[in-house]
Protein backbone atom coordinates (compact mmCIF):
# COMPACT_ATOMS: atom_id res chain seq x y z
CA UNK A 1 0.00 0.00 0.00
CA UNK A 2 1.18 3.52 -0.75
CA UNK A 3 1.61 5.63 2.40
CA UNK A 4 1.80 2.46 4.44
CA UNK A 5 2.15 2.55 8.17
CA UNK A 6 5.74 1.30 8.33
CA UNK A 7 8.06 3.31 10.55
CA UNK A 8 11.80 2.98 11.18
CA UNK A 9 13.32 5.21 13.86
CA UNK A 10 16.80 5.08 15.35
CA UNK A 11 18.74 7.09 17.93
CA UNK A 12 22.42 7.25 18.83
CA UNK A 13 23.39 7.39 22.51
CA UNK A 14 26.48 9.48 21.53
CA UNK A 15 29.00 6.70 22.28
CA UNK A 16 28.61 3.08 21.11
CA UNK A 17 24.92 2.27 20.80
CA UNK A 18 22.29 2.85 18.12
CA UNK A 19 18.81 1.84 19.26
CA UNK A 20 16.18 1.20 16.59
CA UNK A 21 12.44 0.60 16.48
CA UNK A 22 10.69 -0.90 13.45
CA UNK A 23 6.92 -0.88 13.27
CA UNK A 24 4.67 -2.24 10.56
CA UNK A 25 0.92 -2.74 10.86
CA UNK A 26 -0.24 -6.13 9.69
CA UNK A 27 3.16 -7.81 10.09
CA UNK A 28 3.14 -11.17 11.84
CA UNK A 29 4.48 -11.15 15.41
CA UNK A 30 6.89 -14.01 14.67
CA UNK A 31 8.38 -12.29 11.61
CA UNK A 32 12.17 -12.52 11.77
CA UNK A 33 13.81 -9.15 11.08
CA UNK A 34 17.23 -7.57 11.57
CA UNK A 35 18.83 -4.15 11.41
CA UNK A 36 22.10 -3.90 9.47
CA UNK A 37 24.43 -0.91 9.96
CA UNK A 38 26.79 0.08 7.15
CA UNK A 39 28.93 3.17 7.95
CA UNK A 40 30.33 5.33 5.17
CA UNK A 41 33.81 5.77 6.68
CA UNK A 42 34.33 2.94 9.16
CA UNK A 43 35.57 -0.61 8.63
CA UNK A 44 32.95 -2.28 10.78
CA UNK A 45 29.43 -3.43 9.94
CA UNK A 46 26.96 -4.37 12.66
CA UNK A 47 23.71 -6.31 12.91
CA UNK A 48 21.06 -6.73 15.58
CA UNK A 49 17.99 -8.94 15.81
CA UNK A 50 14.71 -7.07 16.05
CA UNK A 51 12.64 -8.41 18.94
CA UNK A 52 8.93 -7.74 19.50
CA UNK A 53 8.07 -4.97 21.96
CA UNK A 54 4.35 -4.67 21.11
CA UNK A 55 1.75 -6.01 18.68
CA UNK A 56 3.28 -4.37 15.61
CA UNK A 57 6.69 -3.06 16.66
CA UNK A 58 10.16 -4.50 17.13
CA UNK A 59 13.31 -3.06 18.67
CA UNK A 60 17.01 -3.76 18.90
CA UNK A 61 20.33 -2.22 19.91
CA UNK A 62 23.33 -2.02 17.62
CA UNK A 63 26.27 -2.41 20.00
CA UNK A 64 29.21 -0.73 18.28
CA UNK A 65 31.84 -1.23 20.98
CA UNK A 66 32.49 -0.92 24.70
CA UNK A 67 29.96 1.39 26.40
CA UNK A 68 32.21 4.44 26.68
CA UNK A 69 34.06 4.12 23.37
CA UNK A 70 33.49 6.94 20.87
CA UNK A 71 32.50 5.00 17.74
CA UNK A 72 30.94 7.74 15.58
CA UNK A 73 31.31 11.47 14.94
CA UNK A 74 29.19 14.25 13.48
CA UNK A 75 30.57 13.66 9.96
CA UNK A 76 29.60 9.97 9.83
CA UNK A 77 26.65 8.65 7.87
CA UNK A 78 25.50 5.15 8.78
CA UNK A 79 23.13 3.49 6.33
CA UNK A 80 20.68 1.38 8.31
CA UNK A 81 18.61 -1.37 6.68
CA UNK A 82 15.65 -3.37 7.98
CA UNK A 83 15.85 -6.90 6.58
CA UNK A 84 13.00 -9.37 7.14
CA UNK A 85 12.92 -13.04 6.32
CA UNK A 86 10.31 -14.03 3.75
CA UNK A 87 10.42 -17.76 3.19
CA UNK A 88 13.99 -18.70 2.31
CA UNK A 89 15.29 -15.20 1.58
CA UNK A 90 15.85 -11.88 3.31
CA UNK A 91 13.96 -8.88 1.98
CA UNK A 92 14.85 -5.24 2.59
CA UNK A 93 11.85 -3.39 4.04
CA UNK A 94 13.34 0.01 4.83
CA UNK A 95 16.61 1.86 4.49
CA UNK A 96 17.84 5.05 6.13
CA UNK A 97 20.84 7.34 5.93
CA UNK A 98 21.48 8.01 9.59
CA UNK A 99 23.50 10.99 10.83
CA UNK A 100 24.29 9.97 14.40
CA UNK A 101 24.72 13.43 15.90
CA UNK A 102 21.47 14.63 14.34
CA UNK A 103 19.55 11.78 16.02
CA UNK A 104 20.69 11.71 19.63
CA UNK A 105 19.01 10.19 22.67
CA UNK A 106 21.31 9.81 25.64
CA UNK A 107 21.08 7.16 28.33
CA UNK A 108 19.03 8.08 31.39
CA UNK A 109 20.99 9.84 34.16
CA UNK A 110 22.28 7.51 36.85
CA UNK A 111 23.60 7.55 40.42
CA UNK A 112 20.89 9.83 41.80
CA UNK A 113 21.51 10.59 45.44
CA UNK A 114 20.35 12.87 48.19
CA UNK A 115 23.23 15.18 49.08
CA UNK A 116 21.42 16.98 51.87
CA UNK A 117 17.83 17.03 53.13
CA UNK A 118 16.03 19.44 55.47
CA UNK A 119 12.41 20.05 56.42
CA UNK A 120 11.59 22.16 53.36
CA UNK A 121 14.56 21.54 51.09
CA UNK A 122 16.43 18.70 49.44
CA UNK A 123 19.65 18.83 47.43
CA UNK A 124 19.97 16.00 44.88
CA UNK A 125 22.81 15.11 42.51
CA UNK A 126 23.16 12.72 39.56
CA UNK A 127 25.58 11.66 36.84
CA UNK A 128 25.22 11.36 33.09
CA UNK A 129 26.01 8.00 31.55
CA UNK A 130 27.85 7.18 28.33
CA UNK A 131 27.70 10.77 27.08
CA UNK A 132 30.21 11.91 24.47
CA UNK A 133 32.99 14.29 25.44
CA UNK A 134 32.11 16.18 22.23
CA UNK A 135 29.20 17.86 24.02
CA UNK A 136 31.49 19.57 26.52
CA UNK A 137 28.88 21.51 28.50
CA UNK A 138 26.19 21.68 25.82
CA UNK A 139 23.54 19.69 27.62
CA UNK A 140 20.25 20.53 29.30
CA UNK A 141 18.17 18.70 31.90
CA UNK A 142 14.55 18.38 32.91
CA UNK A 143 13.54 17.28 36.39
CA UNK A 144 10.27 16.51 38.13
CA UNK A 145 9.19 15.75 41.68
CA UNK A 146 6.33 13.42 42.59
CA UNK A 147 4.29 14.73 45.50
CA UNK A 148 1.86 12.62 47.54
CA UNK A 149 -1.52 12.18 45.86
CA UNK A 150 -0.26 13.20 42.41
CA UNK A 151 0.95 11.40 39.29
CA UNK A 152 4.20 11.90 37.38
CA UNK A 153 2.22 13.42 34.52
CA UNK A 154 0.90 16.12 36.86
CA UNK A 155 4.35 17.00 38.16
CA UNK A 156 5.59 20.38 36.87
CA UNK A 157 8.80 20.21 34.83
CA UNK A 158 11.87 22.05 36.06
CA UNK A 159 14.29 23.00 33.29
CA UNK A 160 18.04 23.33 33.78
CA UNK A 161 19.39 25.09 30.69
CA UNK A 162 22.99 24.15 31.37
CA UNK A 163 25.08 21.13 32.33
CA UNK A 164 24.19 21.15 36.01
CA UNK A 165 24.17 17.75 37.66
CA UNK A 166 22.42 18.78 40.85
CA UNK A 167 19.29 20.57 41.98
CA UNK A 168 18.03 22.12 45.17
CA UNK A 169 14.33 21.42 45.63
CA UNK A 170 12.60 24.01 47.79
CA UNK A 171 9.18 24.70 49.34
CA UNK A 172 8.78 21.04 50.26
CA UNK A 173 6.47 19.86 53.05
CA UNK A 174 8.11 18.52 56.22
CA UNK A 175 8.05 14.81 57.00
CA UNK A 176 6.77 13.94 53.53
CA UNK A 177 7.73 11.20 51.09
CA UNK A 178 8.71 12.38 47.59
CA UNK A 179 10.18 10.89 44.44
CA UNK A 180 12.46 12.63 41.96
CA UNK A 181 13.42 11.99 38.32
CA UNK A 182 15.69 13.70 35.82
CA UNK A 183 16.41 13.39 32.09
CA UNK A 184 19.02 14.87 29.76
CA UNK A 185 19.22 16.19 26.20
CA UNK A 186 22.12 17.48 24.10
CA UNK A 187 21.58 20.85 22.43
CA UNK A 188 22.94 19.38 19.17
CA UNK A 189 20.89 17.54 16.57
CA UNK A 190 17.82 18.29 14.48
CA UNK A 191 16.01 15.09 15.51
CA UNK A 192 17.54 14.80 18.97
CA UNK A 193 15.14 13.91 21.78
CA UNK A 194 15.12 13.63 25.57
CA UNK A 195 16.70 10.64 27.26
CA UNK A 196 14.39 8.30 29.17
CA UNK A 197 13.63 9.46 32.69
CA UNK A 198 16.05 8.25 35.35
CA UNK A 199 15.03 5.65 37.86
CA UNK A 200 13.02 7.49 40.55
CA UNK A 201 14.88 8.51 43.68
CA UNK A 202 12.72 8.28 46.83
CA UNK A 203 13.43 10.64 49.72
CA UNK A 204 11.70 11.99 52.79
CA UNK A 205 11.94 15.49 54.18
CA UNK A 206 12.86 15.94 57.85
CA UNK A 207 10.01 16.42 60.31
CA UNK A 208 9.48 19.93 61.61
CA UNK A 209 10.92 20.49 65.07
CA UNK A 210 8.28 20.40 67.82
CA UNK A 211 6.81 23.81 68.57
CA UNK A 212 7.90 25.19 65.18
CA UNK A 213 6.11 25.32 61.79
Amino acid sequence: AVNGTSRFTCFYNSRANISCVWSQDGALQDTSCQVHAWPDRRRWNQTCELLPVSQASWACNLILGTPDSQKLTAVDIVTLRVMCREGVRWRMMAIQDFKPFENLRLMAPISLQVVHVETHRCNISWKISQASHYFERHLEFEARTLSPGHTWEEAPLMTLKQKQEWICLETLTPDTQYEFQVRVKPLQGEFTTWSPWSQPLAFRTKPAALGKD
Epitope: A1, V2, N3, G4, T5, S6, R7, F8, Q24, W38, D40, I77, T79, L80, R81, R91, M92, M93, A94, I95, Q96, D97, E102, E190, F191
Partner: nanobody, 124 residues
Protein backbone atom coordinates in the same frame (compact mmCIF):
# COMPACT_ATOMS: atom_id res chain seq x y z
CA UNK B 1 6.71 20.73 0.51
CA UNK B 2 8.74 20.02 -2.65
CA UNK B 3 7.21 20.36 -6.11
CA UNK B 4 8.02 17.45 -8.45
CA UNK B 5 8.03 17.37 -12.25
CA UNK B 6 8.71 14.13 -14.15
CA UNK B 7 10.04 13.83 -17.70
CA UNK B 8 11.58 11.22 -20.01
CA UNK B 9 8.57 8.98 -20.64
CA UNK B 10 7.62 7.77 -24.08
CA UNK B 11 7.07 4.82 -26.38
CA UNK B 12 9.81 2.19 -26.53
CA UNK B 13 10.12 -1.32 -27.89
CA UNK B 14 10.44 -4.35 -25.60
CA UNK B 15 14.07 -4.83 -24.58
CA UNK B 16 14.78 -1.10 -24.91
CA UNK B 17 15.74 1.51 -22.35
CA UNK B 18 14.42 4.80 -21.00
CA UNK B 19 15.68 7.24 -18.40
CA UNK B 20 13.11 9.11 -16.36
CA UNK B 21 13.98 12.33 -14.55
CA UNK B 22 12.24 14.08 -11.70
CA UNK B 23 13.11 17.70 -11.02
CA UNK B 24 12.37 18.92 -7.50
CA UNK B 25 11.98 22.48 -6.29
CA UNK B 26 12.41 23.12 -2.59
CA UNK B 27 15.19 23.50 -0.06
CA UNK B 28 14.55 20.17 1.72
CA UNK B 29 15.17 17.86 -1.26
CA UNK B 30 18.69 16.91 -0.19
CA UNK B 31 17.37 15.43 3.08
CA UNK B 32 14.31 13.62 1.71
CA UNK B 33 14.06 10.00 0.55
CA UNK B 34 12.75 9.82 -3.01
CA UNK B 35 10.55 7.26 -4.73
CA UNK B 36 9.29 6.07 -8.06
CA UNK B 37 5.84 4.46 -8.25
CA UNK B 38 3.84 3.33 -11.25
CA UNK B 39 0.20 2.77 -12.12
CA UNK B 40 -0.98 0.66 -15.03
CA UNK B 41 -4.52 1.17 -16.38
CA UNK B 42 -7.09 -0.46 -14.10
CA UNK B 43 -4.47 -1.30 -11.46
CA UNK B 44 -3.40 0.20 -8.15
CA UNK B 45 -0.37 2.43 -7.88
CA UNK B 46 2.64 0.28 -6.95
CA UNK B 47 6.10 0.87 -5.52
CA UNK B 48 8.98 0.68 -8.02
CA UNK B 49 12.10 2.02 -6.29
CA UNK B 50 13.34 4.28 -3.51
CA UNK B 51 16.57 6.03 -2.62
CA UNK B 52 17.83 7.48 0.66
CA UNK B 53 18.63 11.18 0.92
CA UNK B 54 22.39 10.76 0.45
CA UNK B 55 21.95 8.21 -2.34
CA UNK B 56 23.84 5.48 -0.45
CA UNK B 57 20.82 3.25 -0.04
CA UNK B 58 18.36 1.95 -2.61
CA UNK B 59 15.29 -0.27 -2.51
CA UNK B 60 13.54 -1.99 -5.45
CA UNK B 61 10.35 -3.89 -6.19
CA UNK B 62 11.04 -7.52 -7.02
CA UNK B 63 9.63 -7.02 -10.53
CA UNK B 64 12.27 -4.42 -11.49
CA UNK B 65 15.31 -5.54 -9.45
CA UNK B 66 18.34 -5.86 -11.71
CA UNK B 67 16.67 -3.99 -14.60
CA UNK B 68 15.95 -0.56 -13.11
CA UNK B 69 18.35 1.75 -11.27
CA UNK B 70 17.33 4.70 -9.12
CA UNK B 71 19.85 7.50 -8.52
CA UNK B 72 19.89 11.13 -7.48
CA UNK B 73 21.92 14.30 -7.88
CA UNK B 74 21.37 16.53 -4.85
CA UNK B 75 23.29 19.39 -6.49
CA UNK B 76 20.72 19.39 -9.30
CA UNK B 77 17.69 18.55 -7.12
CA UNK B 78 16.95 15.66 -9.46
CA UNK B 79 16.18 11.96 -9.09
CA UNK B 80 16.47 9.48 -11.96
CA UNK B 81 15.12 6.08 -12.92
CA UNK B 82 17.19 4.21 -15.51
CA UNK B 83 14.99 1.50 -17.00
CA UNK B 84 16.65 -1.26 -19.02
CA UNK B 85 15.33 -4.49 -20.57
CA UNK B 86 11.85 -3.01 -20.66
CA UNK B 87 8.88 -5.35 -20.98
CA UNK B 88 5.27 -4.76 -22.05
CA UNK B 89 4.13 -5.23 -18.45
CA UNK B 90 6.25 -2.17 -17.49
CA UNK B 91 3.73 -0.03 -19.36
CA UNK B 92 2.29 2.47 -16.87
CA UNK B 93 2.24 6.07 -15.72
CA UNK B 94 5.38 6.59 -13.61
CA UNK B 95 5.21 8.93 -10.62
CA UNK B 96 8.00 10.55 -8.65
CA UNK B 97 7.35 11.05 -4.93
CA UNK B 98 9.14 12.54 -1.93
CA UNK B 99 9.15 11.11 1.58
CA UNK B 100 9.21 13.14 4.81
CA UNK B 101 12.30 15.20 5.59
CA UNK B 102 14.97 13.11 7.31
CA UNK B 103 12.93 9.91 7.13
CA UNK B 104 13.84 6.41 6.00
CA UNK B 105 12.78 5.03 2.62
CA UNK B 106 10.16 2.29 2.85
CA UNK B 107 8.99 -0.48 0.55
CA UNK B 108 5.44 0.59 1.40
CA UNK B 109 6.19 4.30 1.11
CA UNK B 110 5.59 7.27 3.39
CA UNK B 111 4.88 10.08 0.97
CA UNK B 112 4.73 13.85 1.46
CA UNK B 113 4.37 14.97 -2.15
CA UNK B 114 3.70 13.53 -5.60
CA UNK B 115 4.55 14.50 -9.15
CA UNK B 116 1.99 14.53 -11.95
CA UNK B 117 3.46 11.46 -13.67
CA UNK B 118 4.96 10.58 -17.06
CA UNK B 119 3.66 7.85 -19.36
CA UNK B 120 5.84 4.89 -20.35
CA UNK B 121 4.55 2.55 -23.04
CA UNK B 122 6.46 -0.60 -23.99
CA UNK B 123 5.36 -2.24 -27.21
CA UNK B 124 6.03 -5.84 -28.12
Amino acid sequence: EVQLVESGGGLVQAGGSLRLSCAASGSTFSRQPMYWFRQAPGKEREFVAAITWSGRGTLYADSVEGRFTISRDNAKNTVYLQMNSLRPDDTAAYYCAAGPYGDAAYRHGRIDSWGQGTQVTVSS
